[in-house]
Amino acid sequence: EPHSLRYNLTVLSGDGSVQSGFLAEVHLDGQPFLRCDRQKCRAKPQGQWAEDVLGNKTWDRETRDLTGNGKDLRMTLAHIKDQKEGLHSLQEIRVCEIHEDNSTRSSQHFYYDGELFLSQNLETEEWTMPQSSRAQTLAMNVRNFLKEDAMKTKTHYHAMHADCLQELRRYLKSGVVLRRTVPPMVNVTRSEASEGNITVTCRASGFYPWNITLSWRQDGVSLSHDTQQWGDVLPDGNGTYQTWVATRICQGEEQRFTCYMEHSGNHSTHPVPSGKVLVLQSHWQHHHHHHGLNDIFEAQKIEWHE
């Protein structure tokens, strides 16, 4: 995967007037890195791992740049003509990448009320827009405004591309992105499903990078996909990720089943535990309702491994 730096800025308008302040998030190699949420914000690292390596100068520079970008984006939103009553958002996403062969990519995307309406390749300076008439109207509106703004010249777009890459290279050089690996904590629980059956759930948390294999095995052999249910791999707010896999098995056959985990070249297997039964409300149902596990995770008896 290429190294990447992604800037995501959002500004809001309410009933025709642009609100002060903006929201900015910066992701480095897909990890939340900086966050800034008021006009006079101070960019903060998302997670200790970044703060340890990069000093205050970095935050000062990023804060200054993000604040300037936020102002530009607010001015752009003010010029969008179809402001109606209610809340509206304008979002700018800027991404630059450095690939293994040292080639680079940079792009910029604009979204109005969450809908993409304008993209630009910052290297070729080529603009593209979706086919819908609303998107095209918005795109022409914004492009015209950007052209009017003396700052938005060829030089400006080239600088945006160069600056993003310069920052990315600076971060890579600083060692903040050492392709670090953090192994997961794996926890297996069991819960009553229906008469004669139990549901076993294997959770992996606190791992980085996000790529992981998590599956149930019976007698050492992977169960078929249709007999397992997976949760999404989600950020856990600490610069690491979490996920889960569950399957339903016959009570009394627990010894046959193990959870197999593979991550960054390391692997482990985890048996189904036996232990005390606790009744608890699981938070997992809120995040993973679309996996059809509501019935399993709502009020469940879980045996915790002692």
Epitope: R217, D219, G220, V221, E253, T258, H267, S268, T269, P271
Partner: antibody, heavy 118, light 107 residues
Framework: QVQLQQSGPELVKPGASVKVSCKAS????????IYWVKQSHGKSLEWIGY????????VYNQKFKGKATLTVDKSSSTAYMHLNSLTSEDSAVYYC???????????WGQGTLVTVSA | DIQMTQTTSSLSASLGDRVTITCSAG??????LNWYQQKPDGTVKLLIF???SLQSGVPSRFSGSGSGADYSLTISNLEPEDIATYYC?????????FGAGTKLELK
Amino acid sequence: QVQLQQSGPELVKPGASVKVSCKASGYAFTKYNIYWVKQSHGKSLEWIGYIDPYNGGTVYNQKFKGKATLTVDKSSSTAYMHLNSLTSEDSAVYYCATTDGYSLFTYWGQGTLVTVSA
Amino acid sequence: DIQMTQTTSSLSASLGDRVTITCSAGQGINNYLNWYQQKPDGTVKLLIFYTSSLQSGVPSRFSGSGSGADYSLTISNLEPEDIATYYCQQYSKLPLTFGAGTKLELK
């Protein structure tokens, strides 16, 4: 490629014990279970049990509990089966096998002949 | 324990023949059935897993089918190297059990 190399034939006296080894190569040893199977002369195959080399967890066929003990040495990628209190009924060829994670007994060792005789 | 029955203990066939070996389980096993080949020198090889999935490297003349408690292995065009004993094995329930084997011989 995956290979399972078993120890040579054994001639043992009744009441004694024997340890059959199975050295694995060509894959990450702790990734996949090692299974053990018995084949008495001219007879069919019988599953003895299996071991997870990662954590040493074992599952046995009830019939062989107390007769066979499965262990592994991760440092040498070798699985062992210890058979105790041998009788003529234990005379057989013993196979180790492993999996590719998708099917049981995917790869087999060449077999070890154990003969129990006074 | 689930009893696996291979009613035909030995079977004679000619080269090029289509040969079918059957196996029946003492109860339904949900397609959790494998087929193995054991050569006269004792070498054992997995042919088919999960009733009908051909193991990598196994010639396509081998195929498996069945459901419930009844299963079969078919060799569509018998070759000299297919002379061996064939075993079915269930993994629906512990203990894992094998059939008694069907010895395939040349006519």
